[in-house]
């Protein structure tokens, strides 16, 4: 029985050219986390494997940094980075837990005026 829950940063915004931390946290379960995958739509960004450590996809290696923790830092943001991001926790024996984050990358002038998504 899967008892765990994923807490995420929810809906977030960031400035074009800046960076953002995508963060998920798995709670309410004693299951062992074997691997966390970070995906954007159907594209793999990075993997953190419990035994083998961090693995960044080739197409993102210059703009993605591992951490903090099991989170992921996106750098040099562009408007094209706007969209859904998923943290996929592979656990034993529970199975798979998925969290969703929506990121909007704003033009710097808009971001300066304080436009923000509210975290539900």
């Amino acid at each position: 029985m899967m008892t765990g829950t994923i807490e995420t940063t929810g809906n977030i915004s960031a400035e074009k050219g800046g960076s953002i931390i995508l963060q998920c946290h798995l709670s309410s379960t004693t299951a062992q986390v074997t691997q966390v995958n970070w995906e954007q739509q159907d594209q793999l960004l990075a993997i953190c494997n419990a035994d083998l450590g961090w693995h960044i996809s080739p197409s993102f290696k210059d703009r993605v940094a591992p951490g903090p923790g099991l989170g992921l830092t996106l750098q040099s943001l562009t408007v094209n980075d706007t969209g859904e991001y998923f943290c996929i926790y592979h656990t034993y024996p529970d199975g798979t837990y998925t969290g969703r984050i929506f990121l909007e990358v704003l033009e710097s002038s808009v971001a300066e005026h304080g436009a923000r998504f509210q975290i539900p």
Epitope: T34, Q35, L44, I47, N49, D51, L52, G53, H55, I56, S57, P58, S59, K61, H90, Y92
Partner: antibody, heavy 123, light 109 residues
Framework: QVQLQESGPGLVKPSQTLSLTCTVS??????????WGWIRQPPGKGLEWIGS???????YYNPSLKSRVTISVDTSKNQFSLKLSSVTAADTAVYYC???????????????WGQGTMVTVSS | EIVLTQSPGTLSLSPGERATLSCRAS???????LAWYQQKPGQAPRLLIY???SRATGIPDRFSGSGSGTDFTLTISRLEPEDFAVYYC??????????FGGGTKVEIK
């Protein structure tokens, strides 16, 4: 589809270093999800995993061979290589390269293999 | 390391018969990490089953895998002439390291 091909000397002298290369065709070695591995099989015996490498250079090795093994990758040539030092007759085997799905979790396996190359250690 | 013991060492059967191959692990293995391979003389191994029970691409449905924990089974429902080969199980953990079983030879009776 992805294909693998081993190459290297078929004869190595005792105490020397065995060197093999695996060329990946039909796909990029710079995969976000796959490692690339080496497995060997002495004549008439079973399979023994040697070690595997990620495109970034991250490796994991069989502890029983780790002190003698170096696996490296050359993404510009779409190749990865094996070096096994201080060889003896016991290292005589068919050496295979294969695609390692260790990061795929529920599909962990060696799903694509090269044809293998026989290496004999003898003076 | 996890030792995989395959039995029997040799299985002598006729075409059309059912083959049952056993793989026993010295300690528990996640079924997600258990694979089976077929190897014919002079050829590289070919992946048959991954995740203990999922058939790899292009593998006929007469091949099936089952099991969990320490006991796993490969079943060939009706042996075809091309199925006579050596079969290996393999566990794909990182720590302790991945290992192969010693193999089961399926030969024509």
């Amino acid at each position: 589809q992805v294909q693998l091909q081993e190459s290297g000397p078929g004869l190595v002298k005792p105490s020397q270093t065995l060197s093999l290369t695996c060329t990946v065709s039909g796909g990029s070695i710079e995969s976000g999800v796959y490692y690339w591995g080496w497995i060997r099989q002495p004549p008439g015996k079973g399979l023994e995993w040697i070690g595997s490498i990620y495109y970034s250079g991250s490796t994991y090795y069989n502890p029983s061979l780790k002190s003698r093994v170096t696996i490296s990758v050359d993404t510009s040539k779409n190749q990865f290589s094996l070096k096994l030092s201080s060889v003896t007759a016991a290292d005589t085997a068919v050496y295979y390269c294969a695609r390692d799905g260790v990061l795929t979790l529920n599909k962990r396996s060696f799903d694509i293999w090269g044809q293998g190359t026989m290496v004999t250690v003898s003076s | 390391e996890i030792v995989l013991t395959q039995s029997p060492g040799t299985l002598s059967l006729s075409p059309g018969e059912r083959a049952t191959l056993s793989c026993r692990a010295s300690q528990s293995v996640s079924s997600s990490y258990l694979a089976w391979y077929q190897q014919k003389p002079g050829q590289a191994p070919r992946l048959l089953i991954y995740g203990a029970s999922s058939r790899a691409t292009g593998i006929p449905d007469r091949f099936s895998g089952s099991g969990s924990g320490t006991d796993f089974t490969l079943t060939i429902s009706r042996l075809e002439p091309e199925d006579f080969a050596v079969y290996y199980c393999q566990q794909h953990t990182v720590r302790p390291p991945l290992t192969f079983g010693g193999g089961t030879k399926v030969e024509i009776k």
